[in-house]
């Protein structure tokens, strides 16, 4: 009778086990084992009993222990079984961002893991179970299908074997996937509203805010703002569930013409778009053309008006005839046009806006000097000791320079508060002297003395 | 640090008993798997395994002299002894104990520093 | 009983490689061991489980066992390598030594 021992084992993969065969007489004629494994035999006291350790167990195996004894020959058999957790166990990729409402399918895969009747499949988010299955099928795969919500965000799904061989007096082995971290997003249907201005000029700036409500998670969302090939640098303020960026924006004489201004927002693998038109255009203020800024009196001037091509212009007023971009006027100078305002207005219509712009030359004319009996009157009578102020203003531009002398020498102290005396008395010379020439104009000063009262 | 040292008479007469001890220390024969042999080496010649036991008192000896020898141990006083009867002066050899620390492999990784019996008249 | 048969000498040149086998039927179904012995020296294990080195050996040593043969390997021999060596199996319940070997290094 061959017996051996243990009769079944359960060891790791590419383990060693010993196993001892016996047999019921004391000299047999042979005593041994039939296995495909590595086997050594170990010293041992006695004939009826040989130990083999049996090495690098890969496989569930059923090594024959056999004797022979004068009473015939026997064999025993011992069953291996082979233990070992799954080689390969991941959960299908899937994309990080999820939208709040989508059914997502979560799918695990495992490769290996013996024995399988001991091995079971847990689908889990975080530590709660979602599905249990046992291992079936190489690779053995397991599903679950997931309703997305927004308190889903960032749990972290995960695959995990149980190999339990505690029912052999052994522990429970468990393997765990990478985890899969959802980020679950809500980007409404409704584009974000740009708020810009619909036309800009060249070298100017402009403000533009893109903006959108009912996101989820609203940190999350990024924000690309251009302006044609302009990418801008927002400045982005978050709400609760809303974000409002704002970018400050400049433009060149080469951005010329109808820009895309574009917003979109990305959340999640998901995007929204706005598309607004803005139209840049250059709009240089309009050219005011004196023949002359400065002319002499009684000269003839031309005052010309020339704005943007496609603009309409008024001169002082006067829209061009015919209406369009330049306007002209001709005037004789007078000394009251000195200091006179020429006022162009150009209008030019950009994407249906009416844009103004407005230029101002002053005409200065040349003229004088002059003298004349309203602001230099020629005959003055004051009381002597009295208190008076010489006046004589001479008219001209540029402003004349004014002296009033008597005899060549004695000055009349014109503008100035002077005590009348005898040495007042007398004709005076008055002369008015500036670039445009000189005039005179005699002035006598009477002196009444108190004895003639 | 594992000591073996042998002690017993170094000149026996033919026909008579040889009784060896093997005094070991570092170790001790109730630890599971442990083991104390002898081997002996006559002058000029190859090593000649003798005898063993083990930590579960099962003893082995050499099929040539099974009927001469007795293995036995103390494993309080952490002693081995060897008797060989019927000594001849062929039995001249230095005796040597060993230790197998695992018996069911064999070897023998601490030797003692043997004892040079001469069986003479 | 099994009988284990190692040849009386092998010569080795400095530096060169000895190998010492040792042949015994199913020799590679136990276990085999090694054991240097320097005169007047009580043995040293050097190789034990066909091909475990114990601490304190030098790597050049090493062992292998398959089939008849079990072989002792020295790497790079040394002066100091000349000894005798012996391999030792088992037949149950008997334990076995081979004739030993007379490692002789040249020069």
């Known amino acids: 009778q061959t017996s051996v021992s243990p009769s079944k084992v359960i060891l790791p993969r590419g383990g060693s086990v010993l196993v001892t065969c016996s047999t019921s007489c004391d000299q047999p004629k042979l005593l041994g084992i039939e296995t495909p494994l590595p086997k050594k035999e170990l010293l041992l006291p006695g004939n009826n009993r040989k130990v083999y350790e049996l090495s690098n167990v890969q496989e569930d195996s059923q090594p024959m222990c056999y004797s022979n004894c004068p009473d015939g020959q026997s064999t025993a058999k011992t069953f291996l079984t082979v233990y070992w957790t799954p080689e390969r166990v991941e959960l299908a990729p899937l994309p990080s961002w999820q939208p709040v409402g989508k059914n997502l399918t979560l799918r695990c895969q495992v490769e290996g893991g013996a024995p399988r009747a001991n091995l079971t499949v847990v689908l889990l988010r975080g530590e709660k179970e979602l599905k249990r299955e046992p291992a079936v099928g190489e690779p053995a795969e397991v599903t679950t299908t997931v309703l997305v919500r927004r308190d889903h965000h960032g749990a972290n799904f995960s695959c995990r074997t149980e190999l339990d061989l505690r029912p052999q007096g052994l522990e429970l082995f468990e393997n765990t996937s990478a985890p899969y971290q959802l980020q679950t997003f809500v980007l409404p249907a409704t584009p974000p509203q740009l708020v810009s201005p619909r036309v800009l000029e060249v070298d100017t700036q402009g403000t533009v805010v893109c903006s959108l409500d009912g996101l989820f998670p609203v940190s999350e969302a990024q924000v690309h703002l251009a302006l044609g090939d302009q990418r801008l640098n927002p400045t982005v303020t978050y709400g609760n569930d809303s974000f409002s960026a704002k970018a400050s924006v400049s433009v060149t004489a080469e951005d010329e013409g109808t820009q895309r201004l574009t917003c979109a927002v990305i959340l999640g693998n998901q995007s929204q778009e706005t598309l607004q038109t803005v139209t840049i255009y250059s709009f240089p203020a309009p050219n005011v053309i004196l023949t002359k800024p400065e002319v002499s009196e009684g000269t003839e001037v031309t005052v010309k008006c020339e704005a943007h091509p496609r603009a309409k212009v008024t001169l002082n007023g006067v829209p061009a005839q015919p209406l369009g971009p330049r306007a002209q006027l001709l005037l004789k100078a007078t000394p009251e046009d000195n200091g006179r305002s020429f006022s162009c207005s150009a209008t030019l219509e950009v994407a249906g806006q009416l844009i103004h712009k407005n230029q101002t030359r002053e005409l200065r004319v040349l003229y004088g000097p002059r003298l004349d009996e309203r602001d230099c009157p020629g005959n003055w009578t004051w009381p002597e000791n009295s208190q008076q102020t010489p006046m004589c203003q001479a008219w001209g531009n540029p402003l004349p320079e004014l002296k009033c002398l008597k005899d060549g020498t004695f000055p009349l102290p014109i503008g100035e508060s002077v005590t009348v005396t005898r040495d007042l008395e007398g004709t005076y010379l008055c002369r008015a002297r500036s670039t445009q020439g000189e005039v005179t104009r005699e002035v006598t000063v009477n002196v009444l003395s108190p004895r003639y009262e | 640090q594992v000591q073996l040292k042998e002690s017993g008479p170094a000149l026996v007469k033919p026909t008579q008993t040889l009784t060896l001890t093997c005094t070991f220390s570092g170790f001790s024969l109730s630890t599971s798997g442990v083991g104390v042999g002898w081997i002996r080496q006559p002058p000029g010649k190859a090593l000649e395994w003798l005898a063993l036991i083990d930590w579960d008192d099962d003893k082995y000896y050499s099929t040539s002299l099974k009927t001469r020898l007795t293995i036995s141990k103390d494993t309080s006083k952490n002693q081995v002894v060897l008797t060989m009867t019927n000594m001849d002066p062929v039995d001249t050899a230095t005796y040597y104990c060993?230790?197998?620390?695992?018996?069911?492999?064999?070897?023998?990784?601490?030797w003692g520093q043997g004892t040079l019996v001469t069986v003479s008249s | 009983d099994i009988e284990l048969t190692q040849p009386p000498s092998v010569s080795v040149a400095p530096g060169q490689t000895a190998r010492i086998s040792c042949s015994g039927d199913?020799?590679?179904?136990?276990?085999a061991s090694w054991y240097q012995q320097k005169p007047g020296q009580a043995p040293v294990l050097v190789i034990y489980d066909d091909s475990d080195r114990p601490s304190g050996i030098p790597e050049r040593f090493s062992g292998s066992n398959s089939g008849n043969t079990a072989t002792l390997t020295i790497s790079g021999t040394q002066a100091e390598d000349e000894a005798d060596y012996y391999c030792?199996?088992?037949?149950?319940?008997?334990?076995?030594f081979g004739g030993g070997t007379k490692l002789t290094v040249l020069g």
């Open positions: 030792q199996s088992y037949d149950s319940p008997q334990v076995v």
């Open positions: 060993a230790r197998y620390p695992v018996t069911q492999r064999s070897y023998m990784d601490v």
């Open positions: 199913a020799l590679g179904d136990k276990y």
